[in-house]
Interface confidence: medium
């Protein structure tokens, strides 16, 4: 045969489906590998072909599409499965080809059981809300290509175990969730079970997201620098170990990036000759507000080490702070019998 | 008026897990914007929080007494529980339940019980 | 975890005087504090939420305010039944956490 184009196994697609479900898995190839779809790819003579490899297996085999009720069929790039069994998991390879061209990926698809409360090792989606912001609406995720537009089906919305009537923020209003004002309470997992007929038969979808509150940009805030602050100074003998704390908060901001550094002198810890260690570590709180600290750490501090400038830097989407710390030389205490003495003149 | 009463021995032997129930009255525990919190306080010492949970049975827990503690719900008959295992002397304590109301969007324990004596010794 | 330091311990007042206890945060904690009363034998009490929002029932006397890292508590008038433990609390982030602790005697 001719040389095919692999792309090999996309494991960055790792596909999980419920069993006993049905799952509509489309060919990675249209989506990520080719540049043209498949409606071009059919015009132009191309045949997409199904094949599979079970799980603990090396052998790859055709799917069989001639199950009872066509448990598993093939709707243009689409691969459905009404519904799925546990042992349908393993790695699934799409092909395109004429006599003339070949290209073709591999993807895993694991068929995941779950429990009555809708535990599963699924890997859930987190949509984050934000803390009192005003109706904020989930919606349930994937669903679209099941069923026509004249089909009408019933959703039933779960928060863990327990089904959502009576809530005093969130109401559910078809294939959406409403939060009327998000709260850290509405923290959790939501699920959203789609019933749907399908010739004769009823299907049903679940579907299930963490929902995480975080705090509202309304409230978000430029960084604030708790230490080093004017309250503090770092006294110090030479030889002694110097340990200053940075410590910021940072409120929480969608995709920002929060970043916390130390300059000596106007230069990076990297960028000098002293022996600094910096240790960072973070904490976040319910609404997922970020502090972050960074100890800077001289072991044996000098004389001109204690001369230098010390200044910590933070920086968000909501702009950029810096507040140097108090250090200074501890001066050493008289020592009474030389030094007083002299100072009554004898010699 | 929410009400909270704890109820559980008042005397554990060292060693042994330390059991105690809060039931709830004058409200639903499945109320979607409360948690239920236990504290507890040493004899002449200051408020320690153990751990929290929510009706959907989600908890939390303080890290000091993670290994020893579990806090579990039952909705059907309004109450929560608290177990802590291995109890030592340091345990004695006053146990109070309480409730921590989010409607506001910032949390407080806003109801208590009236506390139980929990005396640790042999 | 944040550790919530309550100054003074302890405190003689007379009735009528303005008394004010500080809570401070180790780390920043937004306005996510909360104050409370405590008399012997009793439980705990809440008196203030959200740094500074009175509790229904709570008498106006009580307010609360700060941000961040420090927090003020302020009894503007004593009155007898005011004598008591006052605790504040962190609600920003787990473990929550408790003050040590203010005893306000009468002088």
């Known amino acids: 045969s001719e040389r095919c184009d692999d792309w090999g196994l996309d494991t960055m697609r790792q596909i999980q489906v419920f069993e006993d479900e049905p799952a509509r898995i489309k060919c990675p190839l249209f989506e990520h590998f080719l540049k043209f779809n498949y409606s071009t790819a059919h015009s132009a003579g191309l045949t997409l072909i199904w094949y599979w490899t079970r799980q603990d297996r090396d052998l790859e085999e055709p799917i069989n599409f001639r199950l009872p009720e066509n448990r598993i069929s093939k709707e243009k790039d689409v691969l459905w499965f009404r519904p799925t069994l546990l042992n349908d998991t393993g790695n699934y390879t799409c092909m395109l080809r004429n006599t003339t061209y070949c290209s073709k990926v591999a993807f895993p698809l694991e068929v995941v059981q779950k429990d009555s409360c809708f535990n599963s090792p699924m890997k859930l989606p987190v949509h984050k809300l934000y803390i009192e912001y005003g109706i904020q609406r989930i919606t349930c995720p994937n669903v679209d290509g099941y069923f026509p537009s004249s089909v009408k089906p019933t959703i039933t919305w779960y928060m863990g175990c327990y089904k959502i009537q009576n809530f005093n923020n969130v109401i559910p209003e078809g294939m959406n969730l409403s939060f009327l004002i998000a709260l850290i309470s509405n923290n959790g997992n939501y699920t959203c079970v789609v019933t749907y007929p399908e010739n004769g038969r009823t299907f049903h979808l679940t579907r299930t997201l963490t929902v995480k509150v975080v705090g509202s940009p309304k409230n978000a805030v430029p960084p604030v620098i708790h230490s080093p602050n004017d309250h503090v100074v770092y006294e110090k003998e030479p030889g002694e170990e110097l340990l200053i704390p940075c410590t910021v908060y940072f409120s929480f901001l969608m995709d920002s990036r929060n970043e916390v550094w130390w300059t000596i002198d106007g230069k990076k810890p990297d960028d000098i000759t002293i022996d600094v260690t910096i240790n960072e570590s973070i904490s976040h709180s319910r609404t997922e507000d970020e502090t972050r600290t960074q100890i800077l750490s001289i072991k044996k501090v000098t004389s001109e080490d204690l001369k230098r400038s010390y200044v910590c830097h933070a920086r968000s989407a909501k702009g950029e702070v810096a507040k140097a710390a108090k250090v200074k030389q501890k001066v050493p205490a008289p020592r009474y019998t030389v030094e007083l003495a002299c100072g009554f003149g004898a010699t | 008026q929410l009400q909270l009463q704890e109820s559980g021995p008042g005397l554990v032997k060292p060693s042994e897990t330390l059991s105690l129930t809060c039931t709830v009255s004058?409200?639903?525990?499945?109320?979607?914007?409360?948690?239920w919190g236990w504290i507890r306080q040493p004899p002449g010492k200051g408020l320690e929080w153990i751990g929290s949970?929510?009706?959907?049975?989600?908890?939390d827990y303080n890290p000091s007494l993670k290994s020893r503690v579990s806090i579990s719900v039952d909705t059907s008959k309004n109450q929560f529980s608290l177990k802590l295992s291995s109890v030592t002397a340091a345990d004695t304590a006053v146990y109070y339940c309480?409730?921590?109301?989010?409607?506001?969007?910032?949390?407080?324990?806003?109801?208590w019980g009236q506390g139980n004596l929990v005396t640790v010794s042999s | 975890d944040i550790q919530l330091t309550q100054s003074p311990s302890f405190l003689s007042a007379s009735v009528g005087d303005r008394v004010t206890i500080t809570c401070r945060a180790s780390q920043g904690i937004s306005s996510y504090l909360a104050w409370y009363q405590q008399k012997p034998g009793k439980a705990p009490k809440l008196l203030i939420y959200a740094a500074s929002t009175l509790q229904s029932g709570v008498p106006s006397r009580f307010s609360g305010s700060g941000s961040g890292t420090e927090f003020t508590l302020t009894i503007s008038s004593l009155q007898p039944e005011d004598f008591a433990t006052y605790y504040c609390q962190q609600v920003n982030s787990y473990p929550l956490t408790f003050g040590g602790g203010t005893k306000v005697e009468i002088k």
């Open positions: 004058g409200g639903s525990i499945s109320s979607s914007t409360y948690y």
């Open positions: 309480a409730k921590e109301d989010d409607s506001s969007g910032y949390y407080s324990f806003d109801y």
């Open positions: 949970i929510y009706f959907t049975g989600s908890t």
